[in-house]
Interface confidence: medium
């Protein structure tokens, strides 16, 4: 669709005569009839196939025609067409004399014709005017013409329809050739696709308007590049949505069970070494001079009764000191200046001379010990507690305080490592001397049967065209994240061209 425009500029009829040579009375009141038709090698009469237009009386005899387009007038003359411009045309311009006010063809005598010109040729669509001048014996006509496209039509033939829009069907203006020029923030064939926030993740994010980044289920963050862990996940992370992969030192379904009690709680006191031994379980190895489960008790060096022969022990900063009774000397009062004659054996002990009476030895009755039978037998001296248990004297009896992981009267029994059900996926647990062993069911391996060796159901690759597949657990099936240019639940359909323009 377009318009053939004809601009009449000047008509010269100096003698004021008709084509017949007869003069007009009082002068030639001139108007024009224009006929536009398809190209003819020889322009002949017949239907004006491209259109026809007439002017009012524009002047008498010779006159210049005013450009009246700005004032809404009829110069240039408009010959609209509703078809593809063929690029060629034929044009007939007739100048007529109007004796009266009725300009209809049937109201005029045939000899009222002043002049008739006919041209034909090629004419491309464009903004530039073609200037032409046609001269006959008695008249001269100067004019120019061009073909331009109607509003919203573009291209070499005015055949391309393009109407700028900014709505659901597109966001664009039209280029001179009729191609779409997307408004800022929009892209795609019809500028219907918003350009998301720069950096918005291609698969995990999307947008409904420019510079937006909306996250698909399971993703978060400004650019939708952070996965959301399973709800309730405490000390864990994810690499794909809804995971809860525990941080080091944490375990359990929601990574809320402390497996590294030593680091998180520092229970061992006085510089002791801490060792994790299971969930919320630990062992403290005390530095010399300390005891207790957490090495919280200071151990007196006199507690081991180092002074012999009734010597009394005094704690000192750098150790201890023995105060020996009369007749004894040495670091531990181990040397005697006594003999059997001095009755050195206490608690009914028998004295035996040695080295020709230079020293002696006491034979002690039951329940007494020491070089002079001065000490009651300490039931803990034989260290009856196994596995590092602590022996405690309780009057006539004794008891063992066991380290974590051991039990029994003498801490001789291992607490079963299998009691915690450490084998995953129905694995069978076997207690060993130094730990445990899991026998895994088919489809699982690893120290705790934690490694799944069965086929991942996602390996069936339900998504086409290199789409990313993951399961959105809030729906009933897997979700395919389609790359640009594909749609469908499995991304199986390429985005097709619409069958016609969407307006």
């Amino acid at each position: 669709s377009g318009v053939f425009q004809l601009q009449l500029q000047e008509f010269i009829n100096e003698r004021g005569v008709l084509a017949s040579g007869r003069p007009c009375e009082p002068g030639c009141r001139t108007f024009f009839r224009v006929c536009l038709k398809h190209f003819q090698a020889v322009v002949s009469p017949g239907p004006c196939t491209f259109g026809t237009v007439s002017t009012p009386v524009l002047g008498t005899n010779s006159f210049a025609v005013r450009d009246d387009s700005s004032g809404g007038g009829r110069n240039p003359l408009q010959l609209p067409f509703n078809f593809t411009w063929p690029g060629t045309f034929s044009l007939i311009i007739e100048a007529w004399h109007a004796p009266g006010d009725d300009l209809r063809p049937e109201a005029l005598p045939p000899d009222a014709l002043i002049s008739k010109i006919a041209i034909q040729g090629s004419l491309a669509v464009g903004q530039n005017w073609l200037l032409d001048e046609q001269t006959s014996t008695l008249t001269r006509l100067r004019y120019s013409y061009r073909v331009i496209c109607s509003d919203n039509y573009y291209g070499d033939n005015c055949s391309r329809l393009c109407k700028k829009r900014n709505d659901h069907f597109g966001h664009y203006v039209c280029q001179p050739d009729g191609n779409l020029s997307c408004l800022p923030g929009w892209t795609g064939e019809y500028c219907q696709q918003p350009i998301c926030l720069s950096g918005c993740h291609e698969q995990n994010g999307y947008c409904s308007k420019p510079a937006e980044c909306l996250c698909r289920p399971g993703w978060q963050g400004r650019l939708c590049n952070e996965c959301i862990p399973h709800n309730g996940c405490r000390h864990g992370t994810c690499s794909t949505p809804w995971q809860c992969t525990c941080d080091e030192g944490w375990g359990g379904l929601f990574c809320d069970q402390d497996l590294n009690y030593c680091t998180h709680h520092s229970p061992c006191k006085n510089g002791a070494t801490c060792s994790n031994s299971g969930q919320r379980s630990y062992t403290c190895t005390c530095r010399p001079g300390y005891t207790g489960v957490d090495c919280e008790l200071e151990l007196s060096e006199c507690d081991s009764n180092p002074c012999r022969n009734g010597g009394s022990c005094k704690d000192q900063e750098d150790g201890y000191h023995c105060l020996c009774p009369p007749g004894y000397y040495g670091l531990h009062c181990e040397h005697s200046t006594l003999s059997c004659a001095d009755s050195p054996c206490f608690n009914g002990g028998s004295c035996r001379e040695r080295n020709q009476g230079a020293n002696y030895a006491c034979e002690c009755p039951p329940n007494f010990t020491g070089s002079n039978c001065e000490k009651k037998v300490d039931r803990c001296t034989s260290n009856p507690c196994a596995n590092g248990g602590q022996c405690l004297n309780r009057g006539p009896s004794r008891m063992c305080r066991c380290r974590p992981g051991f039990t029994g009267t003498y801490c001789e029994l291992h607490v079963s490592d299998c009691a915690r059900n450490p084998c995953a996926h129905g694995g069978t647990c076997h207690d060993l001397e130094n730990g445990l062993m899991c026998t895994c069911p088919a489809g699982f391996s690893g120290r705790r049967c934690e490694v799944r060796t069965s086929i991942d159901a996602c390996a069936s690759s339900p998504c086409f065209n290199r789409a990313t597949c993951y399961t959105d657990l809030s729906t009933d099936t897997f979700v395919c994240n389609c790359p640009y240019g594909f749609v469908g639940s499995r991304c199986e359909f390429p985005v097709g061209l619409p069958p016609s323009f969407p307006w």
């Epitope: 399971g218 995953a424 996602c458």
Partner: antibody
Framework: EVQLVESGGSLVQPGGSLRLSCAAS????????MTWLRQAPGKGLEWVAT????????AYVESVKGRFTISRDNAKNLLYLQMDSLRGDDTAVYFC???????????WGQGTMVTVSS | QSVLTQPPSASGTPGQRVTISCSGS????????VNWYQQLPGTAPKLLIY???QRPSGVPDRFSGSKSGTSASLAISGLQSEDEADYYC???????????FGTGTKLTVL
């Protein structure tokens, strides 16, 4: 069609064992956290155990710890509950369910009845 | 024994609005999301509300959930006869390391 179907429930004597199965279809089983729940006759709902998608971690209600074991076979789309040392108070309808990412159970089986009685 | 407390029963006439409360503690409702289930007589429970106030597809918008502090509530507007069922609230409990249910509320449509 998305569905879970439990099987294996029966009458068992106290101290006995039973293994329940739950067959999943219509969704990607290997991606789902799975759970067993139960409901004693005329009583409310009780959570029993949950297992992560890869089976790496499990959690149990205190009353069944050491007696029940939840496991799964992703290749066969099956969830299991091995129940040992059964007691009278374990009598209930046992449901398997899929755990949404929000600790919410969106797909439930029809349930299977377990009766512990001498 | 249930950790979350619900009223044992509730009732209303068709078209009315009914609210069911659920009271817990800081270790469950206070620090985790709340879910609601509907159990029609003789059937398996059905998820009604998850993550405090989200409705799964297929659940009418007559059902809505909310949470404040250590309490939650389920509201049913435009009550219908088919809403007659048992309703349970539930949440993960960080102290017990387990999923806890409410005592259940029996809703009667008069």
């Amino acid at each position: 069609e998305v569905q879970l179907v439990e099987s294996g429930g029966s009458l068992v004597q106290p101290g006995g064992s039973l293994r329940l199965s739950c067959a999943a279809s219509g969704f990607t089983f290997s991606n789902g956290w799975m759970t067993w729940l139960r409901q004693a006759p005329g009583k409310g709902l009780e959570w029993v155990a949950t297992i992560k998608p890869d089976g790496s971690d499990t959690a149990y209600v205190e009353s069944v710890k050491g007696r029940f074991t939840i496991s799964r076979d992703n290749a066969k789309n099956l969830l299991y509950l091995q129940m040992d040392s059964l007691r009278g108070d374990d009598t209930a309808v046992y449901f398997c369910a899929r755990d949404l990412a929000y600790n919410a159970f969106d797909i439930w089986g029809q349930g299977t009845m377990v009766t512990v009685s001498s | 024994q249930s950790v979350l407390t619900q009223p044992p029963s509730a009732s209303g006439t068709p078209g009315q609005r009914v609210t069911i409360s659920c009271s817990g503690s800081s270790s469950n409702i206070g620090s985790n999301t709340v879910n609601w289930y509907q159990q029609l007589p003789g059937t398996a429970p059905k998820l009604l509300i998850y993550s405090n106030n989200q409705r799964p597809s297929g659940v009418p918008d007559r059902f809505s959930g909310s949470k404040s502090g250590t309490s939650a509530s389920l509201a049913i507007s435009g009550l219908q006869s088919e809403d007659e069922a048992d309703y349970y609230c539930a949440a993960w409990d960080g102290s017990l390391n387990g999923y806890v249910f409410g005592t259940g509320t029996k809703l009667t449509v008069l």
